[in-house]
Each structure stands twice: as structure tokens, then as C-alpha cells.
């Protein structure tokens, strides 16, 4: 295999315990995707994340283990962007109401929406429980992370030709080798302390010319806030 | 191409455990999930439960409390125990491979069962 | 638990007839639904994946439909191999499947 090495997200690193606070499970009887705590009671995921009945997990580092720092509340509310697409993945963006109040601590906060958009060679934290192999599967019970730069919209564009509007960008590698993967969904592409991102698709994982594409925060911040309002 | 194959007592006293075990040959049972669905003789299919080959499982809420599934790498195999068994745990009992993550979306998400082993008759009387 | 309700139960038709099966679901799930095709005395076989997806080598007669709480399976023209019982599944939580229907030829 082109990247057969001890992998973690695909060639991440195991996240040092909480040290991600605002990443969450979501879970349906396994975990199937991510995401990201926005206020006491709301998270942001992928819209392709959709499901009827989510069980939010927060706290989290070992899935597979009560480790004692876990939170679990049940979504009250899982509201998928109106223009949501699932056959382009435009407006890969949800929003789930926690059923209570979320309790925070050390271990469980939130992050911050972006106050601009992302730049170009900015470094960021992806997380998430995602498969940790570029071929096969190997799903990691740690949360993993990776620290990878937002690549240029032209970049992007030119490694997947008319797939990319303007509410996705890039992030990762052009030689390929570190990349989310299946399982990464809904979760946080973190900036400078802001979410800019939320994992969405790509074309496999840790492809060569093949980067990660995410749904760009930036473009919601308006949406998100209304929504909230909306529903609180 | 990958086959299933069921295997394991057709006989078992009630309170009993069944054991089932099934064997993956043509492909490796790694990088996969896995499941057990039986049905009741003229009935209709209930799904067990489901494991990953680290050994991650997620069960039936209705029958978590009496199921515990288990996976053998190094013998391409894996397993189902249900333990206080009745006679309505009578059935044919199939093992199947899942269906994962088609497309370019990074979720986890399933689509069906697409190989089935042709699956055993378990009946449970004393 | 996610309710699958199934119709009808069964159903006669003629070779060449088009075939129309419903599913309903409790709750809304999306597009996690599946439909199988199970022959007597054998294990089910799924035709198609994700409510409308084709799986690889299943005749392009069988189509699937719908999302959310509605989902529909469609033979176009019956064929004698057809025969047997059709399954929907959901897997949106857990996995629960339909009561089934079966098909037979008049």
C-alpha cells in the first residue's frame, strides 16, 4: 500500500486525552460520525450525518471506554441545512439541539464560530474516531488528530473539477498520506481557535491530489445563529 | 469471491447458550462488519447484532441483554452466543456481511447485507 | 425501535405485469433503507442499497423509490424468477426489516 504505516486519523497522531474538548460522537449504537460543540446545547456536523434518533457523546477520548469523563445526551433536535444536496454535498452542514444542557468543564467546551473566512496555508487540528487506514479499514477507539493547512481554492478546484462550489474548501496534503477518513463526518477542521471547517468528503482518503474537502463554516455562521434563535 | 458458512449445534435445551460460529473463506473477514439475523420458521428476519473485526459490537436493544458476538482473525471467523434461550429463539440462524461506505461522504454508514451465508437451523427443545 | 410496515403481505400478478410494493417507516430515516429478495429455503439476497441504489448484477427491472417515511419497490415487467419474498430494511438506528411480501405468478 502507497501509505502502509501506523496511521491515526490517516497519518495523524493519537490526541492527547480531552485535549480536544468540543469534539463529540455521535452515536446510533456505534459511532458514525463526529462534530462540534458550538454552545451548551447545540453542536455542528455534516449534513450527510443525518439520521433520525442521534445520541450525542461528549467527553469523549476511548469510545469504547467508560472512562469517566463522558457526557451522553440525546439530540432533541437535528436540523439539516434546507439546501442540503446530497448528491454534490453542498450545504454539507447540520445542526443538532441537545435534549439538555451540556456541563462545562475542563474536558467539554465549546468552540468558537469563525469571524472570517479561512486563509490559505493556515494550519489546523482535524479530529475524529475515522478510519486510520488509506486502504482497508482500521477504526481507532482514540480520538486521532492531525495538524494540516487550508490548501488555495484553485488547488482545490483543480484536484476535483467541478465538485467544488464555494461553500468547500480544502485542507491536507497534495502528496497525499494524511487525510480524514470514513467515521471523521460532521467533525471539527479547527483554526486559530475557530471552527473554519466540518469534515464532508473526498475522493477516498489520503489520496495523492486527492485532499479532504470541507464544508466551510464561514458561509453559515448567519444561518447558524438564526436557527438557534429559532429554536430555542 | 467471499463465502459464509454457519456452523454450530441444531440442537439446544432450553436456558441453554447457542453457539453459533461462522466462517469467512474466499477473502479476509479484517477491514469488515459482520452480522447475525435469524428467522423464525414462516416468518420474517430479525437482526442480532453486528461486530467489527477489533471486536467492536453493536447489538438488538431487544436481545442485548443475552447476546454476546466475538470475532477470530487468525481463523477468519466469528461468533454468536445466546445465553436463557426459549423455544422462541428457534430459527434459522444466518451470518452476513455488511455493506459499508460507498461513495465519497466520510461518515460511517451501511448498506445492507450483500453476502449471506445459507444459514443453520437452530431449534431449542429439551 | 424503528417500525417497518410492509404492503401488502402478498400479492399475484402475471408474467410482464409491473409490481408495486410499499414501505413505511415509523419515523423519518432518510434514505437508510434496503430491499432484499429472499427464495425458499434460501438465504436473502440484496437488490438494492441506500432506497434507490442498484446493487452490482441485480436486473435493471427492480428499482427502488422515496425518503424519509415512504419508500417504494418496483418490479417493471415480472419475471418467473421473481418469485419469492421481498424484505425492506432500514438502518437509520439499529436495523429492523419489514414484515415482508411475497410474490407469486397468477
Known amino acids: 500500500a502507497p501509505f502502509d504505516d501506523d496511521d491515526k486519523i490517516v497519518g495523524g497522531y493519537n490526541c492527547e486525552e480531552n485535549s480536544v474538548p468540543y469534539q463529540v460522537s455521535l452515536n446510533s449504537g456505534y459511532h458514525f460520525c463526529g462534530g462540534s460543540l458550538i454552545n451548551e446545547q447545540w453542536v455542528v456536523s455534516a449534513g450527510h450525518c443525518y439520521k433520525s434518533r442521534i445520541q450525542v457523546r461528549l467527553g469523549e477520548h476511548n469510545i469504547e471506554v467508560l472512562e469517566g469523563n463522558e457526557q451522553f445526551i440525546n439530540a432533541a433536535k437535528i436540523i439539516r441545512h434546507p439546501q442540503y444536496d446530497r448528491k454534490t454535498l453542498n450545504n454539507d452542514i447540520m445542526l443538532i439541539k441537545l435534549s439538555s444542557r451540556a456541563v462545562i468543564n475542563a474536558r467539554v467546551s465549546t468552540i468558537s464560530l469563525p469571524t472570517a473566512p479561512p486563509a490559505t496555508g493556515t494550519k489546523c487540528l482535524i479530529s475524529g474516531w475515522g478510519n486510520t487506514a488509506s486502504s482497508g479499514a482500521d477504526y481507532p477507539d482514540e480520538l486521532q488528530c492531525l495538524d494540516a493547512p487550508v490548501l488555495s481554492q484553485a488547488k482545490c478546484e483543480a484536484s476535483y473539477p467541478g465538485k467544488i462550489t464555494s461553500n468547500m474548501f480544502c485542507v491536507g496534503f497534495l502528496e497525499g498520506g494524511k487525510d480524514s477518513c470514513q467515521g471523521d463526518s460532521g467533525g471539527p477542521v479547527v483554526c486559530n481557535g475557530q471552527l473554519q471547517g466540518v469534515v464532508s468528503w473526498g475522493d477516498g482518503c489520503a489520496q495523492k491530489n486527492k485532499p479532504g474537502v470541507y464544508t466551510k463554516v464561514y458561509n453559515y455562521v448567519k444561518w447558524i445563529k438564526n436557527t438557534i434563535a429559532a429554536n430555542s | 469471491q467471499v463465502q459464509l458458512q454457519e456452523s454450530g449445534p441444531g440442537l439446544v435445551k432450553p436456558s441453554e447458550t447457542l453457539s453459533l460460529t461462522c466462517t469467512v473463506s474466499g477473502g479476509s473477514i479484517s477491514s469488515y462488519y459482520w452480522s447475525w439475523i435469524r428467522q423464525p420458521a414462516g416468518k420474517g428476519l430479525e437482526w442480532i447484532g453486528r461486530?467489527?473485526?477489533?471486536?467492536?459490537?453493536n447489538y438488538n436493544p431487544s436481545l442485548k441483554s443475552r447476546v454476546t458476538m466475538s470475532v477470530d482473525t487468525s481463523k477468519n471467523q466469528f461468533s454468536l452466543k445466546l445465553s436463557s434461550v426459549t423455544a422462541a429463539d428457534t430459527a434459522v440462524y444466518y451470518c452476513?456481511?455488511?455493506?459499508?461506505?460507498?461513495?465519497?461522504?466520510?461518515?460511517?454508514?451501511?448498506?445492507?447485507?450483500?453476502?449471506w451465508g445459507q444459514g443453520t437451523t437452530v431449534t431449542v427443545s429439551s | 425501535d424503528i417500525q417497518m410496515t410492509q404492503s401488502p403481505s402478498s400479492l399475484s400478478a402475471s408474467v410482464g405485469d409491473r409490481v408495486t410494493i410499499t414501505c413505511q417507516a415509523s419515523?423519518?430515516?432518510?434514505?437508510?433503507l434496503n430491499w432484499y429478495q429472499q427464495k425458499p429455503g434460501k438465504a436473502p439476497k440484496l437488490l438494492i442499497y441506500?432506497?434507490?441504489n442498484l446493487e452490482t448484477g441485480v436486473p435493471s427491472r427492480f428499482s427502488g423509490s422515496g425518503s424519509g417515511t415512504d419508500f417504494t419497490f418496483t418490479i417493471s415487467s415480472l419475471q418467473p424468477e421473481d418469485i419469492a419474498t421481498y424484505y425492506c430494511q432500514q438502518d437509520d438506528n439499529f436495523i429492523t426489516f419489514g414484515g415482508g411480501t411475497k410474490v407469486e405468478i397468477k
Open positions: 461486530i467489527y473485526t477489533s471486536g467492536s459490537t
Open positions: 419515523q423519518d430515516i432518510s434514505n437508510y
Open positions: 441506500d432506497a434507490s
Open positions: 452476513a456481511r455488511d455493506l459499508t461506505n460507498y461513495g465519497s461522504g466520510k461518515s460511517i454508514r451501511f448498506y445492507g447485507m450483500d453476502v
